[in-house]
Amino acid sequence: SGPVKELVGSVGGAVTFPLKSKVKQVDSIVWTFNTTPLVTIQPEGGTIIVTQNRNRERVDFPDGGYSLKLSKLKKNDSGIYYVGIYSSSLQQPSTQEYVLHVYEHLSKPKVTMGLQSNKNGTCVTNLTCCMEHGEEDVIYTWKALGQGDNQFHDGATLSIAWRSGEKDQALTCMARNPVSNSFSTPVFPQKLCEDAATDLTSLRG
C-alpha cells in the first residue's frame, strides 16, 4: 500500500489510475469510488464487471494492464478512488488510494472596474478579474502586454494609478487552473479612466 496518489483531469477528458502488481496469482481487483463499488475484475477468468452500466463505456484498461482509465470525465467524478488487489498468496489485500480532481476548461475571465477616484489628473482604481461561473482553484495574474511573459501582479485585483498624459499600457488578466489557462480581453487604463470621467460628467450635467 503506497501513499495517496493525486490525479488531475479535465471535464470531457480522461485520466489513468496507475496500478502495477508483482503478484502472480491475482484472484480479484476491486475499484471503488467514494466507497461505491466501481469495477470488479477477476483476471483468471477474464471477467470485468462494471457496477453501474453508464460507466461501462467510460472504463478501459490500457494495454491490457491493471491500470484503470476513466474517460468522458465529469465534474462529479472528483473524489476518492480506492483499489484492492486480492490474492490467496497475500495475507491481506494490497491497496492503493487516489484522489482525483476534475477541473473545467476555463472560459474567458471578465474584468470589472471598482470605485474610482480622480484627483489632480490622476485616476486611481481597482481592476478585478473573475470567472463568471465561479470555477474552483483559479489563480489570477496580471500582465502588461508587449512586455514579454513578465507578470507584474499576482492576484485577482489590481490597483492602478494613471496620470493624464501618460502613455497608455494594455493590461490583461490570465486565469489559470490545473488543466487550462485563459486570457481576458485587454483593458486600457486611459480608456477606462476617460470613459469613467465622461460618465461622471454626464451624471453631473
Epitope: 508483482k22 502472480k24 475484475i41 483476471p43 483468471e44 477468468g45 477474464g46 471477467t47 470485468i48 464487471i49 461501462r56 484498461f61 494495454d63 491490457g64 494492464g65 491493471y66
Partner: antibody, heavy 120, light 107 residues
Framework: QVQLQQPGAELVRPGASVKLSCKAS????????MNWVKQRPGQGLEWIGM????????RLNQKFKDKATLTVDKSSSTAYMQLSSPTSEDSAVYYC?????????????WGQGTSVTVSS | DIVMTQSQKSMSTSVGDRVSITCKAS??????VAWYQQKPGQSPKLLIY???YRYTGVPDRFTGSGSGTDFTFTISNVQAEDLAVYYC?????????FGAGTKLELK
C-alpha cells in the same frame, strides 16, 4: 516495444524431438504468462498450454500432456516448448503468445510462429 | 472442455457495410471471451477481450458484446484491410478453446 522472436522454420525427422524457442523483449518477462498455440495448415487455433516464467508453473492442455514440455530460461528471457516423438500430425505453425494482465488467458502479443515440418 | 461454436464459416461483405459474427459457448463463460483477427501469413491479433473491451490501438469500428454463452463481434463500416479470419476464444477456464474461425470476404 514488446517483441516475441521465433525461428521461421524447423525440419524434424519423425520420432526425433524438437525444441522450439521464443525470445521475449521489451517487457518484464517474469511478470506475464506465456502461451503456446498450434495451427495446422488451413486450420484453426489450438491452445497447447501456458507457463509463468517467475516460477515455471505450467498449465497444459491434457491433449498435449504427452507431447509438449514447456520450460523457460529467465536469464535470456526465452520460453521453450519441446515436442516429443513428432509425427506428421505435429506438422504445424507453433506460436508463442503473451497473456494480458487484466485477463490472464487472453493473448495480446504473438510471435511470428515457427513452421514445423515433420518429414523423413 | 468448453466448445466455442462459430456457425458462420465465411461471410461476404462490401466496404462500408456492417457485419456481425456470432460465437456460442457450450457453457457459461460470463464475459470471458476474446476475439482475434488473423490475416494470411500473419499471427493472430487481439482485438477484444472480456467480451467487450477493445484492446489498445484497435479502431472503434470493432466492437464486442454478449455474456453467458452468446457473444457477438461487429465491424461497422468494413474496410478492405478488415478482410481476414476472425476467431473467438474463451478465456474463462483452461484448456483455452477457440472457435473454428469465420472468414470475412468481399462480395
Amino acid at each position: 516495444q514488446v517483441q516475441l522472436q521465433q525461428p521461421g522454420a524447423e525440419l524434424v525427422r519423425p520420432g526425433a524431438s524438437v525444441k522450439l524457442s521464443c525470445k521475449a523483449s521489451g517487457y518484464s518477462f517474469t511478470t506475464y504468462w506465456m502461451n503456446w498455440v498450434k495451427q495446422r495448415p488451413g486450420q484453426g487455433l489450438e491452445w497447447i498450454g501456458m507457463i509463468h516464467p517467475s516460477d515455471s508453473e505450467t498449465r497444459l492442455n491434457q491433449k498435449f500432456k504427452d507431447k509438449a514440455t514447456l520450460t523457460v530460461d529467465k536469464s535470456s528471457s526465452t520460453a521453450y516448448m519441446q515436442l516429443s516423438s513428432p509425427t506428421s500430425e505435429d506438422s504445424a505453425v507453433y506460436y508463442c503468445a503473451r497473456s494480458t494482465m487484466i485477463a490472464t488467458r487472453a493473448m495480446d502479443y504473438w510471435g511470428q510462429g515457427t513452421s514445423v515440418t515433420v518429414s523423413s | 472442455d468448453i466448445v466455442m461454436t462459430q456457425s458462420q464459416k465465411s461471410m461476404s461483405t462490401s466496404v462500408g457495410d456492417r457485419v456481425s459474427i456470432t460465437c456460442k459457448a457450450s457453457q457459461d463463460v460470463i464475459t470471458g471471451v476474446a476475439w482475434y483477427q488473423q490475416k494470411p501469413g500473419q499471427s493472430p491479433k487481439l482485438l477484444i477481450y472480456s467480451a467487450s473491451y477493445r484492446y489498445t490501438g484497435v479502431p472503434d469500428r470493432f466492437t464486442g458484446s454478449g455474456s453467458g454463452t452468446d457473444f457477438t463481434f461487429t465491424i461497422s463500416n468494413v474496410q478492405a484491410e478488415d478482410l481476414a479470419v476472425y476467431y473467438c476464444q474463451q478465456h474463462y477456464s483452461t484448456p483455452l478453446t477457440f472457435g473454428a474461425g469465420t472468414k470475412l470476404e468481399l462480395k
